[in-house]
């Protein structure tokens, strides 16, 4: 046969669906490798091809599309569960082909196992709201194309375990779930359950949504620097460990990236000759402000040590801030005394 | 300095209505969600109702839901309360204040007394 | 929705004596609890929040403490301007709920 293009396995699609559920999966062929989709590429001539490894073991097998209530089905670039086993978990490759041209990729299948409170090992998508903003809509997430619109699904939503009724802030809304004036006590897993007929059969999706509650665009602010700062002076003698701590306050931005970083006579920690260790930790305050600590220490300070400038800086997407630390040689010279 | 004071209190009959205004000075009003707090003579502290920062959500106490509205016009920085088919268990002094999260009702006006009685 | 208990009802504290005054949840509220200060004819003040910080202006003889559903308000030296009617008050779930309040009186 001829040569046929293989995308591999695409791990990036980690496809994860529930046992005993309906799972509608496309081909990734047509989203992410190919410049055309389906329609044209059926137009052309060119035939979809399916077949599967299961878990554990290296031999390709055709899908069995012949199965009882045609359980499992290929619809264009679509192949449906109806629903799901178990054992359906493993990886399944779409070839598309025709006797000059071929191209396939294979992709994981997980059929991921629930108890009654929704909990097992789906990853969940999270979705970061602002807290004491007005109002804000989650929606059931990867439900389009399971039913035609002229169905009307019941929708249950659930906090956790409980089936959200009479929540004072939190008000289903069909697909929607809206949440007015939030707060951190909202955080955690919202579930949606979605039932539809189809063919005289009741079919249930379960899609779940991690909340997280975090800090308000309007309490952004540049970075906050609480040490070092002007009331601490780092008094040493030579040949002390010298330790100065650069703690950083940032508040929440989405898809800020929070940077900290010492100079020393204005240079970067790696393009000076003095052996500097350099420790960084991270702390985060229920709705996602950022506390980050860089410890710049020095084994043995020498008096040259005691005479560089040290600076912290810090940068978020609001701005900068520099505060230098009060380093002197003890004995030498009066400023004022060192207080903590 | 912070100030909320608020307006338009008195003696209506039942069933009638009545709107609260609480003007806010000292501070910008668009960053602070708001509230409405009342006590009934000799008794302790209900929440009313709460208004985002953005006048976009709303939440009441079951007591008066249906029967008032919070809103606030941040360009006149003011916050009202519109009181409708007003009950005599509704007679207390309304206040309004400000909260943040963080910090829940840290500022408070002088509060205004609403009657209800035939 | 969530209920705060204050207790005692009253408190009798001599001048200069110490006031412990409690305050429990129905469920846990985390550290999402605050104290005021009412006096007659008065609006409340804002005295602890988050549990255990002082409000601005509050002084130090105020100190909050507890977590969950338990939590204590202590005035460690009562001067007279103290005594007056606290309220704890739980912002950690909508609706925002307070206590019955704690009357504080001279004995």
């Known amino acids: 046969s001829e040569r046929c293009d293989d995308w591999g396995l695409d791990t990036m699609r980690q496809i994860q669906v529930f046992e005993d559920e309906p799972a509608r999966i496309k081909c990734p062929l047509f989203e992410h490798f190919l410049k055309y989709n389906y329609s044209t590429a059926h137009s052309s001539g060119l035939t979809l091809i399916w077949y599967w490894t299961r878990q554990d073991r290296d031999l390709e097998e055709p899908i069995n599309f012949r199965l009882p209530e045609n359980r499992i089905s290929k619809e264009k670039d679509v192949l449906w569960f109806r629903p799901t086993l178990l054992n359906d978990t493993g990886n399944y490759t779409c070839m598309l082909r025709n006797t000059t041209y071929c191209s396939k990729v294979a992709f994981p299948l997980e059929v991921v196992q629930k108890d009654s409170c929704f909990n097992s090992a789906m990853r969940f998508p999270v979705h970061k709201m602002y807290i004491e903003h007005g109002i804000h809509k989650i929606t059931c997430p990867n439900v389009d194309g399971y039913f035609p619109s002229s169905v009307k699904p019941s929708v249950t939503w659930y906090k956790g375990c409980t089936e959200i009724v009479d929540f004072h802030n939190v008000l289903p809304e069909g697909m929607n779930l809206s949440f007015f004036i939030p707060l951190v006590s909202n955080n955690g897993n919202y579930t949606c359950v979605v039932t539809y007929p189809e063919n005289g059969r009741l079919f249930h999706l379960t899609r779940t949504v991690t909340v997280k509650v975090v800090g308000s665009p309007k309490d952004a602010l540049p970075p906050q620097i609480y040490s070092p700062n002007d009331r601490v002076v780092y008094e040493k003698e030579p040949g002390e460990e010298l330790v100065i701590p650069c703690k950083v306050y940032f508040s929440f931005i989405m898809d800020s990236h929070n940077e900290v970083w010492w100079t020393i006579d204005g240079k970067k920690p790696d393009d000076v000759t003095v052996d500097i260790t350099i420790n960084e930790s991270v702390s985060y305050s229920s709705t996602e402000d950022e506390t980050r600590t860089q410890i710049l220490s020095i084994k043995k300070v020498t008096p040259e040590d005691l005479r560089r400038n040290y600076v912290c800086h810090a940068r978020n997407t609001k701005g900068e801030a520099e505060q230098a630390a009060k380093v002197k040689q003890k004995g030498n010279g009066c400023t004022e005394p060192m207080t903590l | 300095e912070v100030q909320l004071l608020e307006s338009g209190g008195g003696l209506v009959q039942p069933g009638g209505s009545l709107r609260l205004s609480c003007a806010a000075s000292?501070?910008?009003?668009?960053?602070?969600?708001m509230s409405w707090v009342r006590q009934a003579p000799g008794k302790g502290l209900e929440w009313v109702s709460a208004?985002?920062?953005?006048?976009?959500?709303?939440l009441y106490a079951d007591s008066v839901k249906g029967r008032f509205t919070i809103s606030r016009d941040n360009s006149k920085n003011t916050l009202y309360l519109q009181m409708n088919s007003l009950r005599a268990e509704d007679t207390a002094v309304y206040y309004c204040?400000?909260?943040?999260?963080?910090?829940?009702?840290?500022?408070w006006g002088q509060g205004t007394l609403v009657t209800v009685s035939s | 929705e969530i209920v705060m208990t204050q207790s005692p009802a009253t408190l009798s504290v001599s001048p200069g004596e110490r006031a412990t005054l409690s305050c429990r949840a129905s469920?846990?509220?985390?550290?999402?609890l605050a104290w005021y200060q009412q006096k007659p004819g008065q609006a409340p003040r804002l005295l602890i929040y988050?549990?255990?910080t002082r409000a601005t202006g509050i002084p130090a003889r105020f100190s909050g403490s507890g977590s969950g559903t338990e939590f204590t308000l202590t005035i460690s030296s009562l001067q007279s301007e103290d005594f007056a009617v606290y309220y704890c008050?739980?912002?950690?779930?909508?609706?925002?709920?307070f206590g019955q309040g704690t009357k504080v009186e001279i004995k």
């Open positions: 469920q846990s509220v985390s550290s999402n």
């Open positions: 008050q739980q912002y950690n779930n909508w609706p925002w709920t």
């Open positions: 208004i985002s920062y953005d006048g976009e959500g709303t």
């Open positions: 204040a400000r909260f943040r999260y963080y910090t829940a009702f840290d500022y």
């Open positions: 000292g501070f910008p009003l668009s960053n602070y969600g």
């Open positions: 988050g549990a255990s």
